[in-house]
Interface confidence: medium
């Protein structure tokens, strides 16, 4: 004799029972009414189960919770199968067999006949698992039932200090959805919240789950599919205050069938988004767009923002969204990168954009600019990036294009080519005045607009210049005299340790900033307007560190242990970090802080000259970095402020050196055999460079390196013209997001040493 | 004056080893890249070896590569190079160069200035 | 690593300009902006004309000049001098630590 293998399976679902109401004392579970109904509600659905053919397998049941409506009662039920039966038992088998039941003309006195009216169509069954019922059960002391009525914005009210996890079973009109917003109030908490699409905690229905206060979203709402949800909180500490206020509405469904015709232009058109926008979308998704182009001259341009579309088998879900274009199947997924979907007009008839989500488990809401792109030529004067759709500077010694095509083929690398013979020059011999080409072509076309390339400077009319890096140089070179505008800055004040590194004189760094908490240098910055300082992204990644409130910036300061009249000190009321910082990577390491109040200008404060997107700095060229920090790897911050020159690295070497860890958005200084460098304290301060105008222009901030000064590893910075443009759209008011390696590599921030 | 000496050449048998030096003087050593590169009887020259100021950076010439061995003594200020298993096509004169402003980061791969050479003729 | 090629032999008479030309690949001179140029009088160890592609070490005569175009470096030595005619080396990083050598040009100074 083989006893037989049965597994346990596990279904949840509600039914309706159209002969009762609900009433408040059924939301309550310590009450005697919801013992007294859940009671009797569990033998009416063993007796469903038990006179099907189910009945053999069945294990136990609970009715856990009721809802409103005609009385609609929550349950699950455990039956025991056969192994060999496992996979023919699904939820719809099983509702099926229910339903017939109920439809039944059999004559059994049973309860779901004689004393409750159970309506077949209001069945919904859901496949459960045993970790499922635990997580249910754990919440039962702290169990939530509410009803949100339109128009009604519900505060729900977190664990008190008895209980460690609630559970919250939100229900509304069955033509409305769910949605749940959760704004976090503290900065360090362990709480963990997660959100189900069902009435229960679901693991197979879970939309998201969060944990520790998130400052990447400070504040984020959550849709259901349609009108019931569950929430779970679990408390991670001991807290008297909640970290999170936790509110939910009824909302209407919002369609996103969108028929577009666009113009034949070739700037942003608009965007197509997901329902409710930022919101996360919803686990039941379909989104269809179709857009008309006015000639197959142009291709359509999807840009994207930290999310990207791969191609993806056809058997595997889509986790973050699916999309169809042009019967192309690709799945959506986060990134920290940009990323543009280019797709080619073969048709007349435009395109139509499907995104759908595959399974419960969303994201944060999908938002989508469009613009056509020419198709004989995608990206006039740089290269078409094929991975990922973007159009990056060509030839400039830079990888920007993660299979390097773009540095591939170059007749001139980081070099002007000449015209006559193709023979490559030094970049700054460009329109100097002094011919370098056989036929002068080098001095050609300075005085005039030519077509836009790498080297090539933007004027504010959209126009473009030959001549290198022609930013406040004294000589107008734009039409429009925008190379010359916003100029005041970059001019040392007074001008007569860093690792290696010698004192700095009174306004000889006017725009040095040190970032403060309760008095302690840690972090240098960059003053680069009159209400913004620059510096490194990575000095905010610990929570204890992450609020504006908590830092003081003082500028026009020589010593730390002292003050001095020309300085002076400035509250920070926002902070803005880049939006695909990664602390992993380093990569995009970049803050702007703004100041509670504008800056004075003097001797000893005015800012540092930024960049445009074009501008060169030559690989070779010494340039400058200063900062409080330590003076040795591991030592103490410096009280004197200290400055160093270093040698720009070509980055091909740079990034031989660190084995490939070198993004685009980074620069590498410093010398061969180390010794100077900047150190832990010099994180986000300034590293500038010199043009021959006497303007100093800020090439990079101190980021990250291999120790400090050692020999045959240089130190890393942010490369500022690669950030230039996200630098702009915060300072013009355009966002940007605004919120409150190898073994040894350490960040430059005396908080940071790993 | 700045100079390079290089001595240990001469004729061996193939198979066997030859240790060749360079001193080096008349500027700080340990502030530069150290190369050794060889022209063989009327052949164009061949670079060989390169070491960092530190020795934590080495290069070989795939021809040379796992029978040559460069090494250097800061202390003593002199270059090294290891040749074990030697063979007719090594015959050239050696010569141990300086790479060009040793302060800097990053190399620009370019000797300024050279030695004389020394003679390694491998026959039987 | 394979070396950089050179042709073997270039002339000019006295006062003219003459380019030689070092082809390599996109792995050293097309990759990186590290050519140097050296000169190799009879029975002398070779000196350094060029480096960087087309800067001059102090000393070395303006005539002297280095450029660059995709995979070739070409120098060109203008008001061609008779204590010009010498063997020519260009020389390329190649990445990984190494560098490559051309096969050398025999310059000759006609007259």
């Known amino acids: 004799y083989k006893a037989e293998v049965t597994v346990s399976q596990v279904y949840s679902g509600s039914l309706r029972v159209l002969n009762r109401h609900f009433s408040q004392d059924l939301g309550r579970r310590e009450s005697i009414a919801f013992r007294s109904e859940s009671a009797k509600a569990q033998k009416m659905l063993q007796e469903l189960v038990a006179s099907t053919r189910l009945g053999t397998y069945y294990n136990s049941s609970s009715v856990y919770s009721f809802g409103e409506g005609p009385l609609t009662c929550f349950f699950w039920f455990i039956l025991d199968i056969p192994e060999y039966q496992r996979l023919t038992l699904s939820p719809e088998v099983v509702r099926e067999l229910l339903v017939d039941e109920l439809l039944s003309n059999s004559s059994t006195l049973a309860s779901y006949k004689t004393e409750y009216e159970v309506d077949p169509e209001g069945l919904v069954i859901l496949e459960a698992s045993v970790n499922d019922i635990v997580v249910l059960n754990s919440t039962l002391g702290c169990y939530r039932y509410s009803y949100v009525n339109p128009g009604q914005v519900l505060p729900l009210k977190g664990p008190d200090q008895q209980t460690t996890s609630c559970l919250w079973h939100l229900q509304g009109p069955e033509d409305l959805m769910i949605k749940v917003r959760l704004e976090w109030t503290r900065v360090d908490c362990r709480d963990r919240v997660a959100m189900y699409d069902a009435a229960g905690p679901l693991e197979k229905r879970l939309i998201t789950s969060v944990y520790g206060c998130s400052r990447q979203e400070p504040v984020m709402e959550v849709l259901a599919s349609g009108s019931v949800m569950a929430v779970v909180w679990k408390k991670g500490m001991h807290s008297y205050y909640d970290p999170f206020l936790l509110s939910v509405k009824s909302v209407a469904f919002q369609d996103c069938q969108v028929n577009l015709t666009l113009e034949g232009r070739l700037d942003t058109q608009g965007f197509l988004r997901t329902p409710y926008y930022p919101s996360y979308y919803s686990p039941s998704t379909h989104c269809s767009w179709h857009l008309t182009v006015p000639s197959l001259d142009y291709g359509l341009a999807l840009w994207f923002d930290a999310y990207a579309l791969r191609r993806q088998k056809y058997n595997r879900l889509c986790t973050q969204g699916q999309w169809m274009i042009q019967n192309r199947r690709l799945c959506g997924f986060r990134t920290l990168q940009p990323y543009a979907e280019r797709i080619p007009m073969v048709a007349s008839d435009g395109v139509t954009i499907n995104f759908t989500s595959q399974i419960s488990l969303t994201g944060p809401g999908v938002q989508v600019y469009y613009s056509l792109y020419n198709q004989s030529d995608p990206c006039p004067g740089e290269f078409l990036c094929s991975v990922n759709g973007l159009c990056v500077p060509a030839c400039d010694g830079i990888k920007d294009c993660p299979n390097g095509l773009d540095e591939r083929n170059c007749v001139c690398r980081a070099m002007f080519q000449c015209q006559e013979d193709s023979t490559c020059i030094s970049l700054p011999r460009v329109c100097d005045r002094q011919p370098d080409c056989l036929n002068g072509s080098d001095e050609e076309q300075c005085q005039e607009g030519v077509p836009c390339g790498t080297f090539t400077f933007q004027c504010e009319d959209r126009s473009c210049v030959k001549k290198p890096n022609p930013e406040c140089d004294g000589q107008s070179d734009c039409r429009d005299g925008s190379d010359e505008q916003h100029c005041d800055c970059g001019l040392q004040g007074l001008s007569s340790r860093i690792v290696g590194g010698t004192v700095s004189s009174e306004g000889e760094w006017p725009w040095q900033a040190s970032l403060q908490i309760r008095g302690r240098h840690i972090c240098g910055g960059a003053l680069i307007a009159d209400r913004w300082v620059i510096t490194a992204a990575h000095c905010f990644q610990e929570d204890s560190m992450a609020s504006p409130k908590l830092w003081t910036v003082f500028l026009g300061k020589m010593r730390q242990n002292s003050r001095w009249p020309g300085e002076v000190s400035f509250k920070v009321s926002r902070l803005f970090l880049h939006p695909y910082h990664e602390e992993d990577s380093h990569d995009y390491d970049v803050a702007l802080l703004q100041l509670d109040h504008p800056v004075v200008y003097s001797a000893t404060v005015r800012p540092v000259c930024l960049p445009a997107r074009s501008h060169f700095f030559e690989p070779g060229q010494h340039c400058w970095i200063t900062g409080w920090g330590a003076q040795r790897e591991g030592g103490p911050v410096s009280n004197t402020l200290q400055k160093v020159d270093v040698q720009l690295v070509p980055q091909d070497l740079c990034s031989e050196a660190y084995r490939y860890q070198v993004s685009p958005r980074m620069l590498c200084a410093g010398y061969r055999k180390g010794k100077k460098d900047a150190c832990q304290g010099d994180s986000g301060g300034p590293l500038v460079c010199r043009e021959p105008s006497g303007r100093w222009f800020l090439a990079g901030l101190v980021s990250w390196g291999l120790g400090c000064g050692r020999p045959n590893f240089f130190g890393v910075y942010t490369r500022v013209t690669r950030v230039i443009n996200w630098i702009q759209q915060v300072l013009t008011g355009g966002g940007g997001s605004g919120g409150g390696g190898s073994h040894h590599h350490h960040h430059h921030g005396s908080h940071h040493h790993h | 004056e700045v100079q390079l000496v290089e001595s240990g050449g001469g004729l061996v048998q193939p198979g066997r080893s030859l240790r060749l030096s360079c001193a080096a003087s008349?500027?700080?050593?340990?502030?530069?890249?150290m190369y050794w590169v060889r022209q063989g009887p009327g052949k164009g020259l061949e670079w060989v070896s390169g070491i960092s100021w530190n020795s934590d950076t080495i290069g070989y010439a795939d021809a040379v590569k796992g029978r040559f061995t460069i090494s250097r003594d800061n202390a003593k200020n002199v270059l090294y190079l290891q040749m074990n298993s030697l063979r007719p096509e090594d015959t050239a004169l050696y010569y141990c160069a300086r790479e060009k402003d040793g302060d800097f980061y990053y190399n620009y791969f370019v000797m300024d200035v050279w030695g004389q050479g020394t003679t390694v003729t491998v026959s039987s | 690593q394979s070396a950089l090629t050179q042709p073997p032999s270039a002339s000019g008479s006295p006062g003219q300009s003459v380019t030689i030309s070092c082809t390599g690949t996109?792995?050293?001179?097309?990759?990186?902006?590290?050519v140097s140029w050296y000169q190799q009088h009879p029975d002398k160890a070779p000196k350094v004309m060029i480096y960087e592609v087309s800067k001059r070490p102090s000393g070395v005569p303006d005539r002297f000049s280095g450029s660059k175009s995709g995979n070739t470096a070409s120098l060109t030595v203008s008001g061609l001098q008779a204590e010009d005619e010498a063997d020519y080396y260009c020389?390329?990083?190649?990445?990984?630590?190494?560098?490559?050598f051309g096969g050398g040009t025999k310059l000759t100074v006609l007259g």
């Open positions: 008349g500027f700080t050593f340990d502030d530069h890249v």
């Open positions: 020389s390329s990083y190649a990445g990984s630590n190494k560098v490559v």
């Open positions: 996109s792995s050293d001179v097309g990759f990186y902006n590290f």
